[in-house]
């Protein structure tokens, strides 16, 4: 295969080929987040729509309880965009003893959880200081990259402040992964 | 196929396999937009270069009249970056009755048009408030995600203000899609 | 192949099929940059981690001396995120004769070098004016798109100011490519 003429007269073991259409894939879209208690120094995970509108999961890629479950080992492209919105951050206006305040910030992290491993792994992080001088502000953070994942790995999206996430439109805040 | 040893001695129907090299793909790059009248509340669509420089379309993925035409149903990764540029947004400077103005903003939308469906579908949106205090400003908005598309679907990129799009370099503003 | 029943009884040349798992792929992560001399008007290239942590190269995709070396011609998806961080840019505060200063900026370029071609080609550019009024600031620039590359092409990531790159975490600043 791989570019050579195919000659069926000699038995041969080929590298595993598979139809692209049966690879695990998911595109999840934002939903309004339910109020949850979360620890001060821990970024809360978003939960997602997995079947309505533009959202889907297919070929054994399942979504459950804020996690995308990886059904098969391989290299995956993983992406997410989170749109944040808020009222003016006053960080530039109040200066104590002439010293600017620590800026506010917005952060998105795509995290991998492996049951056999005690600590989650941060795969991707987008973090931005927010020091707006206008009134209400809004902006997206986009992330995407390729990672080698194992069957059973779980993926989630964590954010620095769940109350700043724009949940109003499925095209503004989303999360997806597909086996390459 | 799919990981089993290949045994040509028994007739068998296989899942559809296809060479990766013959999948529909396109990468379009920015061109200077022609002067056009557009309606106040409608985001204008960008038109694109499809064959010069870095731009290409291949394997029946065609570009015509601001649209990428999807030649085959399947899951596509779609992406775009639009770099915006402008002179100072005055939103932070003019405050009426101590109240900041509504911020200016820049928005990119990747839109799907299906002839059998009356309304376009917004697949991806990147939107950002712009309230710059320096002189000239510039910044990109990047979008990318996977969607299930049907043969005959058309994709376009719409922006909030066509006059703010940086058309000067093909690596700053672009639009692409490929069948997974 | 391509969806037809497979009939091994007649010799036939098939489109080149190949296992997805043996395609060239790399995900590189940030390391602290070594001090280097670079020319004033030339953006320095970043060097990268290619095997520790989340980083890997596989299937003849090699990393050497700041370059990813393309081992096989084809269409590649190429991506990078660079997180920048700095102290306040004062560009908005010092106005000479009522005129705002030229803004500071941060820029990422993904560049292709082809030995047979004298000039590098800029594939992707993300550039952003930075005119922050708070104290320390930080923000990412993300890029990703598909390009037709030739065997022997080399890819690198250049930045406008290497001292502003956040090298502290492998999930904040990264560079990758994979054959589609």
């Amino acid at each position: 295969l791989k570019g050579q003429e195919f000659a069926p007269s000699h038995q041969q073991v080929y590298a595993p080929l598979r139809a692209d259409g049966d690879k695990p894939r998911a595109h999840l879209t934002v939903v309004r987040q339910t109020p949850t208690q979360h620890f001060k120094n821990q970024f809360p995970a978003l939960h997602w729509e997995h079947e309505l509108g533009l959202a889907f999961t297919k070929n054994r890629m399942n979504y459950t309880n804020k996690f995308l479950l990886i059904p098969e080992s391989g290299d995956y492209f993983i992406y997410s965009q989170v749109t944040f919105r808020g009222m003016t951050s006053e960080c530039s206006e109040i200066r104590q003893a002439g010293r600017p305040n620590k800026p506010d910030s917005i952060t998105v992290v795509i995290t991998k959880v492996t049951d056999s491993y005690p600590e989650p792994t941060q795969l991707l992080m987008g973090t931005k200081s927010v020091c707006e001088v206008g009134s209400n502000w809004f902006q997206p953070i986009y992330l995407g990259a390729m990672f080698s994942l194992q069957e059973g790995d779980k993926l989630m999206v964590n954010v620095s402040d769940i109350s700043l996430v724009d949940y109003t439109k499925e095209d503004k805040t989303f999360f997806g992964a597909f086996l390459l | 196929l799919k990981g089993q040893e290949f045994a040509p001695s028994h007739q068998q129907v296989y899942a559809p396999l296809r060479a990766d090299g013959d999948k529909p793909r396109a990468h379009l790059t920015v061109v200077r937009q022609t002067p056009t009248q557009h309606f106040k509340n409608q985001f204008p669509a960008l038109h694109w270069e499809h064959e010069l420089g870095l731009a290409f379309t291949k394997n029946r993925m065609n570009y015509t009249n601001k649209f990428l035409l999807i030649p085959e149903s399947g899951d596509y990764f779609i992406y775009s970056q639009v770099t915006f540029r402008g002179m100072t947004s005055e939103c932070s400077e003019i405050r009426q009755a101590g109240r900041p103005n509504k911020p200016d903003s820049i928005t990119v939308v990747i839109t799907k048009v299906t002839d059998s469906y009356p309304e376009p579908t917004q697949l991806l949106m990147g939107t950002k408030s712009v309230c710059e205090v320096g002189s000239n400003w510039f910044q990109p908005i990047y979008l990318g995600a996977m969607f299930s598309l049907q043969e005959g679907d058309k994709l376009m990129v719409n922006v909030s203000d066509i006059s703010l799009v940086d058309y000067t370099k093909e690596d700053k503003t672009f639009f692409g899609a490929f069948l997974l | 192949l391509k969806g037809q029943e497979f009939a091994p009884s007649h010799q036939q040349v098939y489109a080149p099929l190949r296992a997805d798992g043996d395609k060239p792929r790399a995900h590189l992560t940030v390391v602290r940059q070594t001090p280097t001399q670079h020319f004033k008007n030339q953006f320095p290239a970043l060097h990268w981690e290619h095997e520790l942590g989340l980083a890997f190269t596989k299937n003849r995709m090699n990393y050497t001396n700041k370059f990813l070396l393309i081992p096989e011609s084809g269409d590649y998806f190429i991506y990078s995120q660079v997180t920048f961080r700095g102290m306040t840019s004062e560009c908005s505060e010092i106005r000479q004769a009522g005129r705002p200063n030229k803004p500071d900026s941060i820029t990422v370029v993904i560049t292709k070098v082809t030995d047979s071609y004298p000039e590098p080609t800029q594939l992707l550019m993300g550039t952003k004016s930075v005119c922050e009024v708070g104290s320390n600031w930080f923000q990412p620039i993300y890029l990703g798109a598909m390009f037709s590359l030739q065997e022997g092409d080399k890819l690198m990531v250049n930045v406008s100011d290497i001292s502003l790159v956040d090298y502290t975490k492998e999930d904040k600043t990264f560079f990758g490519a994979f054959l589609l």
Partner: antibody, heavy 119, light 111 residues
């Protein structure tokens, strides 16, 4: 140094066409857009459109749409502006100007070509 | 249709300072690329004086400066010289991507 040298004056009858040339030197012709601007006697400047010499793409002012054609010959680094269906009010000096990509200001100008439309 | 409005004429004695204004009828003019200023001396082609509201191309004396306030741009000439006499035009791009010129201002240097 950058130079834009235009063709000589023309006298045309109403309904005819005129083609003005603008030869560029001192820079890479395909790297900068060329604009055409005209000035009727004793009047102000009026923009007609732009031409990208590399791709041949053009953008015309609405007023001239359908009557103006801008082209480039890359082999000779020459831009052309053709205006058809001439009328007496098209009598003007026609300028080509090279644009600054970043700001779209008109940085270098040709010396101008007087086109007189008279029966 | 957007317009840029300039005063038809201004004048000043040598050594004086004059300011020419350029007011836009629409907020989208100049939003992307600013306002540019050109000088046209009698019988010659226009010459770029100021680009993007403020910036002087090399070779333009620092007697010429540009500024912006709200929807207006201004060109200021200090230390007026007799050779500054001529026409001055502001120019910008509107939201439909068409270039616009102001009507022009005739500068007369007195005496």
């Amino acid at each position: 140094q950058v130079q834009l040298v235009q063709s000589g004056a023309e006298v045309k009858k109403p309904g005819a066409s005129v083609k003005v040339s603008c030869k560029a030197s001192g820079y890479t012709f395909t790297s900068y857009d060329i604009n055409w601007v005209r000035q009727a006697p004793g009047q102000g400047l009026e923009w007609m459109g732009w031409l990208n010499p590399n791709s041949g793409n053009t953008g015309y002012a609405q007023k001239f749409q359908g009557r103006v054609t801008m082209t480039a010959d890359r082999s000779t680094s020459t831009a052309y502006m053709e205006l058809s269906s001439l009328r007496s009010e098209d009598t003007a000096v026609y300028y080509c100007a090279r644009e600054v990509p970043e700001t779209a200001a008109f940085e270098y100008w040709g010396q101008g070509t007087l086109v007189t439309v008279s029966s | 249709q957007s317009v840029l409005t300039q005063p038809p004429s201004v004048s000043g004695a040598p050594g004086q300072r004059v300011t020419i204004s350029c007011t836009s009828s629409s907020s989208d003019i100049g939003a992307a690329l600013g306002v540019h200023w050109y000088q046209q001396l009698p019988g010659t082609a226009p010459k770029l004086l100021i680009e993007g509201y403020y910036n002087r191309p090399s070779g333009v004396p620092d007697r010429f400066s540009g500024s912006k306030s709200g929807t207006s741009a201004s060109l200021t000439i200090t230390g007026l010289l007799p050779e500054d006499e001529g026409d001055y035009y502001c120019q910008s791009w509107d939201g439909t991507l068409s270039a616009l010129f102001g009507g022009g201002t005739k500068l007369t240097v007195l005496g």
